[in-house]
């Protein structure tokens, strides 16, 4: 049985050019994360490994980071940065669990954060 | 030297689920250098990567698939499972399991070339 | 995803005789670590495809030195420098720098 919940960051927005960290958290659960997949729509933008590391998709390697921890940094924002990110935690014994993040790249100086929240 | 050998059926129903598998002799498949993939091809024609499993779990799959596959491995058999979904006529393929080399350096890592394939069971869907 | 075109689409060689083929990508297999990540297979008529070049020209074991490649960024080739009888198939170039992995239409290579 799944029990874990997946806490992101939620709707967030940053302005062009500035720079996001993407992050969720898995709690409620004591399964091992085996890998996180960063996705944008149907994109991969990342993977993290537990044993293997980081795989950046060569597209975003010049605008990912990695981190912090099992999170993801995006670098020089753009309007069409602007959609849904999804963050695909694989865990052993429980299976999947997808926590989604919306980001709003902004041309304006305004960026204020959104609240966090939880997707069961 | 290691194999790998599919199992599963030769006809489908439509609507219904495929599922194979894919048996690994004369090698772990909990070696940390590999990952293990699904690949099809439809008749006469080219290839399609499916998706791809660790052995500790992590998974990719192929987008233009996703919303109907799963993929998952058992390593106390030593070896790795393909379920694809609401399958139709388009879906009859040759389906093959095959082990691709991770390069894996300075904290990043990489997937290089699938080095050893299965011989590849014909899925026809029909009723 | 990356789209790889292969060239020509079928082959007609006198054994003995060189072959060509190429595989272009739709953007740069831009190399990580210093790697590309561009592999190389054939299909034998009725068997599953098997590697004969990885990292764009490294020759798997046991692939005979007839058979080399080379390429970067988004052209690529395999030769053969004498086709034998026994190299006629499908053969195929695949990316994996990024996924989804992905293989080029496949080139027909037959004896005349």
């Known amino acids: 049985m799944m029990t874990g919940t997946i806490e992101t960051t939620g709707n967030i927005s940053a302005e062009k050019g500035g720079s996001i960290i993407l992050q969720c958290h898995l709690s409620s659960t004591t399964a091992q994360v085996t890998q996180v997949n960063w996705e944008q729509q149907d994109q991969l933008l990342a993977i993290c490994n537990a044993d293997l590391g980081w795989h950046i998709s060569p597209s975003f390697k010049d605008r990912v980071a990695p981190g912090p921890g099992l999170g993801l940094t995006l670098q020089s924002l753009t309007v069409n940065d602007t959609g849904e990110y999804f963050c695909i935690y694989h865990t052993y014994p429980d299976g999947t669990y997808t926590g989604r993040i919306f980001l709003e790249v902004l041309e304006s100086s305004v960026a204020e954060h959104g609240a966090r929240f939880q997707i069961p | 030297q290691v194999q790998l050998q599919e199992s599963g059926p030769g006809l489908v129903n439509p609507s219904q689920t495929l599922s194979l598998t894919c048996i690994v002799s004369g090698g772990s498949i909990r070696s940390g250098d590999y990952y293990w993939s699904w690949i099809r091809q439809h008749p006469g024609k080219g290839l399609e990567w499916i998706g791809y499993i660790y052995y500790s779990g992590g998974t990719y799959y192929n987008p233009s698939l996703k919303s109907r596959v799963t993929i998952s491995v058992d390593t106390t058999k030593n070896q790795f499972s393909l379920k694809l979904s609401s399958m139709t006529a388009a879906d009859t393929a040759v389906y093959y399991c095959a082990r691709g080399s991770i390069a894996a350096r300075s904290g990043y890592f990489y997937f290089s070339g699938l080095d050893v394939w299965g011989q590849g069971p014909t899925v026809t869907v029909s009723s | 995803e990356i789209v790889l075109t292969q060239t020509p689409l079928s082959l007609s060689v006198t054994p003995g005789q060189p072959a060509s083929i190429s595989c272009k990508s739709s953007?740069?297999?831009?190399?990580?670590?210093?790697?590309?990540?561009l592999s190389w297979y054939l299909q034998k008529p009725g068997l599953p495809p098997q590697v004969l070049i990885y990292?764009?020209?490294n020759r798997f074991s046991g692939v005979p030195d007839r058979f080399s490649g080379s390429g970067s960024g988004t052209d690529f080739t395999l030769k053969i420098s004498r086709v034998e009888a026994e190299d006629v198939g499908v053969y195929y170039c695949m990316q994996s720098i990024q996924l989804p992995l992905t293989f080029g239409g496949g080139t027909k290579v037959e004896i005349k």
């Open positions: 953007q740069s297999l831009l190399p990580s670590e210093g790697k590309t990540y």
């Open positions: 990292e764009v020209s």
